[in-house]
Each structure stands twice: as structure tokens, then as C-alpha cells.
């Protein structure tokens, strides 16, 4: 699987999950998030050669087409597969609130 | 929606579904498919600027991060959203068989 366990341990050029730290205030301008100050959102990147973690029949077909037609511009793209939530602390005035934000952290990637 | 209705009618540079005709024999080397000879598989391509048909909170966050950090290499990618099946005819010996291949045709795209 193209997940953090594999990708963070290997120098993988092809489609894999990459570490990306985002600071809420500096990178997004979100002043309302109190804790954490930032988090590892991660992202997916790298080429999708034929049959690499293909998501659907279409991506397999497209990968094969691309292999047999190297001049073609159509090829699958490396995108998130599994995402996890992030728990944050914010304030409503002076009152602290805890919220779970869905689909915030990329754990693995696929070729789609 | 970034679907065939919109994308095929507009000269859209950003993420959109593009027409792609695949000939089973010539492009894939699939001699076993009798009918059709080929089909419009289509594909997704084009930049994913901030907020364009974002798939998840993560892709929105990544788009925002990319906008505020233009030097960043992390950005969402244009990939299939809705896929449709394709019905094919093939032969097992002299016996014709009809099969529906799932997820063969891209109908719309998203930034993921």
C-alpha cells in the first residue's frame, strides 16, 4: 500500500504520500484554531506508471494506454486514498470547544 | 459540475473531463474484445486552482495552502469523479458473451 508506513521509509519516486506540515495561522490564515498550531496534512505526488495502485478499471486502462502511447498526455494522477480526521481546539469567545474535522490528513495514495 | 455536458462545450483550461477515444486493438492490444472496436474512455486534466470542485476538506486546505504558498509543489490533482460502465461483446471460442465492464468511462472530474 502507498501509505505513510511505506512511503515515509522509502525514497520512492513514483506515486506516494509525502509529508507536508501546515501551520494554521501562517499557511492558511486560520486564526480561529487554537490547538494544534499546525499538523501534518501530507500530500500525494509522483508518476503513476502502468498498474501502480490503480484505483479503477479506467485508471488501469489509462495507464496501459499511456504505456503503449508514450506521447499521450492522458495518464492517471496520484491522489489521496485514505484520509483521517484531525481533532482541534478552538474558542467561542472564552469558551473552549473541541471539534473533529473530517478528511484532513492523507494516510495513503492511489493512482486515479 | 465538471462533466461532459460542461467540459465538452467549453474551452476550459482548468480541471475538466477531456475526450479520449481508445481503440481496443491498436491502443491497448486487446484482441479479445469483439465489439465495440473502441470507445470514449475520456480522461481528466487541467490545473486545480483554489476551490475548483474540491473533493474533500484536505483538497480545499491543500488548494488554499498552494494559493498562499505559490512556491509549494503540493497541489490537488484533476481526477475522475463519476465513471460509467461499458458493455462489450467478446467470444469464448465460438460462443458470444456480453459483459459489462465497470468504471470504464469518465463522465466528470474533481480536484482531489
Amino acid at each position: 500500500a502507498l501509505d505513510t508506513n511505506y512511503c515515509f521509509r522509502n525514497l520512492e519516486e513514483n506515486c506516494c504520500v509525502r509529508p507536508l506540515y501546515i501551520d494554521f495561522r501562517q499557511d492558511l490564515g486560520w486564526k480561529w484554531v487554537h490547538e494544534p498550531k499546525g499538523y501534518y496534512a501530507n500530500f500525494c505526488s509522483g508518476p503513476c506508471p502502468y498498474l501502480r495502485s490503480a484505483d479503477t478499471t479506467h485508471s488501469t486502462v489509462l495507464g496501459l494506454y499511456n504505456t503503449l502511447n508514450p506521447e499521450a498526455s492522458a495518464s492517471p494522477c496520484c491522489v489521496p486514498q485514505d484520509l483521517e480526521p484531525l481533532t482541534i481546539l478552538y474558542y467561542v469567545g472564552r469558551t473552549p470547544k473541541v471539534e473533529q474535522l473530517s478528511n484532513m490528513v492523507v494516510k495513503s495514495c492511489k493512482c486515479s | 459540475a465538471l462533466d461532459t455536458n460542461y467540459c465538452f462545450r467549453n474551452l476550459e483550461e482548468n480541471c475538466c473531463v477531456r475526450p479520449l477515444y481508445i481503440d481496443f486493438r491498436q491502443d491497448l492490444g486487446w484482441k479479445w474484445v469483439h465489439e465495440p472496436k473502441g470507445y470514449y474512455a475520456n480522461f481528466c486534466s487541467g490545473p486545480c486552482p483554489y476551490l475548483r470542485s474540491a473533493d474533500t476538506t484536505h483538497s480545499t486546505v491543500l488548494g488554499l495552502y498552494n494559493t498562499l504558498n505559490p512556491e509549494a509543489s503540493a497541489s490537488p490533482c484533476c481526477v475522475p469523479q463519476d465513471l460509467e460502465p461499458l458493455t462489450i461483446l467478446y467470444y469464448v471460442g465460438r460462443t458470444p458473451k456480453v459483459e459489462q465492464l465497470s468504471n470504464m468511462v469518465v463522465k466528470s472530474c474533481k480536484c482531489s
Partner: antibody
Framework: QVQLVQSGAEVKKPGSSVKVSCKAS????????ISWVRQAPGQGLEWMGG????????NYAQRFKGRVTITADESTSTTYMELSSLRSEDTAVYYC?????????????WGQGTLVTVSS | ETVLTQSPGTLSLSPGERATLSCRAS???????LAWYQQKPGQAPRLLIY???SRAPGIPDRFSGSGSGTDFTLTISRLEPEDFAVYYC?????????FGQGTRLEIK
């Protein structure tokens, strides 16, 4: 230049609903919290609630809970305020405003206001 | 909810004079959860002061805010003709956000 442009005036019957829009331009919409404030004719200001775009966390004044819904559409940088079960006392100018960044905060940019008249 | 009481209800002064507007909260707001706005007829409110004493961008330095706890003051050191309007204080320490009833500053 930051601008919040609201939809036009509305005349509504008692018991019906109204949905007012507020389109942002000139700044990063999803980095800000948007609040809604209303002002009855000749009266003071009354906060209704606010929303954090992207994550769609909304916070409402207790007296409007169940009657007001504030949403954000990031793709168009637009916030909506829908008020249901309208009564004559809801006749007011409705303003959207961006806060300085917190959920409850001072409001630095305001829309031009939308007059909602509730009359039978 | 926190009730804000502004005084006086109406203040009649002449250009060049000093204006002192008061805002009292029904419970302590600490030192940084109060804002002041100016509103002219037919216009949206305009933020003057936030955090009790910080001037918003573009606001002339004749406007100043002070106070903490339950008592806050907006001072206009030297009134200009364009300063005559209604002034509101706002608290954002607790939900719901509340506003004072306003002080009308009129030309004497």
C-alpha cells in the same frame, strides 16, 4: 480591496423563509469567519450567528436557534443566511460581516445590508 | 447573555470638543473582548476599536479606547464634523455576541 456584496431586498409573507447571500471578493474567503447581524428599523444591532467556511462550523445566538441556518459555499466565496418562520418582528436590515479571525470577534468588513420586509 | 449599557443615550457637542462615551458590561469581559463601531444613517457599521484599545486600520488617532473588566470608554479627542453619528460597543467574550443600545453623538 475587500468587499462583501449582499443580495437584494426581499418582501416576505409571515411564516415563510428568506435566504440572503453574501459574496466575498478581494481576500481569502475561507481564512475568515463570517457573522450575520441584523438591525430593525430605528433599532440597535443584533448578532444572529456565524460560520467558519470549509469546515462549516456554525455558531448561533440562542434566540435564533432552530430558525436560522448559516452556510458557506467555498466554490463561490458566498455565505448564506436563511431565516424561517418569519414574523413581522423580523423586518430588518441584515448584514454579513467578516470577523478579525476568531469565531466570536470584532467585525472589520461589512456588506451593504439587505432589507427584509415581512408583511402580510 | 452579557448586557451592555451605553451612556449617555445622546451626547450633544460641538466640533473641536472632546467626546467621552461609556459602555458598561453586566459581567466582566476581561481586557480584550470589546469593540467600538460608528454607524451613519443608511450605512453599515464601521469598526473603530477592537480588543478594547486597538485602533482598526485606517482609523484616525483621535479615536481611542480604554477600560477592562466591566467599564470601557471610547474617547474622541477632537471632534470633526464627520464624527457625528451613532456609536455602538460590542462584546465578544461570550456567546451570543451582544451590542450596546448605542450613543447618538449630535452637533450642539
Amino acid at each position: 480591496q475587500v468587499q462583501l456584496v449582499q443580495s437584494g431586498a426581499e418582501v416576505k409573507k409571515p411564516g415563510s423563509s428568506v435566504k440572503v447571500s453574501c459574496k466575498a471578493s478581494g481576500y481569502t474567503f475561507v481564512s475568515n469567519v463570517i457573522s450575520w447581524v441584523r438591525q430593525a428599523p430605528g433599532q440597535g444591532l443584533e448578532w444572529m450567528g456565524g460560520v467558519i467556511p470549509i469546515v462549516d462550523i456554525a455558531n448561533y445566538a440562542q434566540r435564533f436557534k432552530g430558525r436560522v441556518t448559516i452556510t458557506a459555499d467555498e466554490s463561490t466565496s458566498t455565505t448564506y443566511m436563511e431565516l424561517s418562520s418569519l414574523r413581522s418582528e423580523d423586518t430588518a436590515v441584515y448584514y454579513c460581516a467578516s470577523t478579525l479571525g476568531l469565531v466570536l470577534d470584532a467585525m472589520d468588513y461589512w456588506g451593504q445590508g439587505t432589507l427584509v420586509t415581512v408583511s402580510s | 447573555e452579557t448586557v451592555l449599557t451605553q451612556s449617555p443615550g445622546t451626547l450633544s457637542l460641538s466640533p473641536g470638543e472632546r467626546a467621552t462615551l461609556s459602555c458598561r458590561a453586566s459581567q466582566s469581559l476581561g481586557s480584550s473582548y470589546l469593540a467600538w463601531y460608528q454607524q451613519k444613517p443608511g450605512q453599515a457599521p464601521r469598526l473603530l476599536i477592537y480588543g478594547a484599545s486597538s485602533r482598526a486600520p485606517g482609523i484616525p488617532d483621535r479615536f481611542s479606547g480604554s477600560g477592562s473588566g466591566t467599564d470601557f470608554t471610547l474617547t474622541i479627542s477632537r471632534l470633526e464634523p464627520e464624527d457625528f453619528a451613532v456609536y455602538y460597543c460590542q462584546q465578544y467574550a461570550d456567546s451570543p455576541i451582544t451590542f450596546g443600545q448605542g450613543t447618538r453623538l449630535e452637533i450642539k
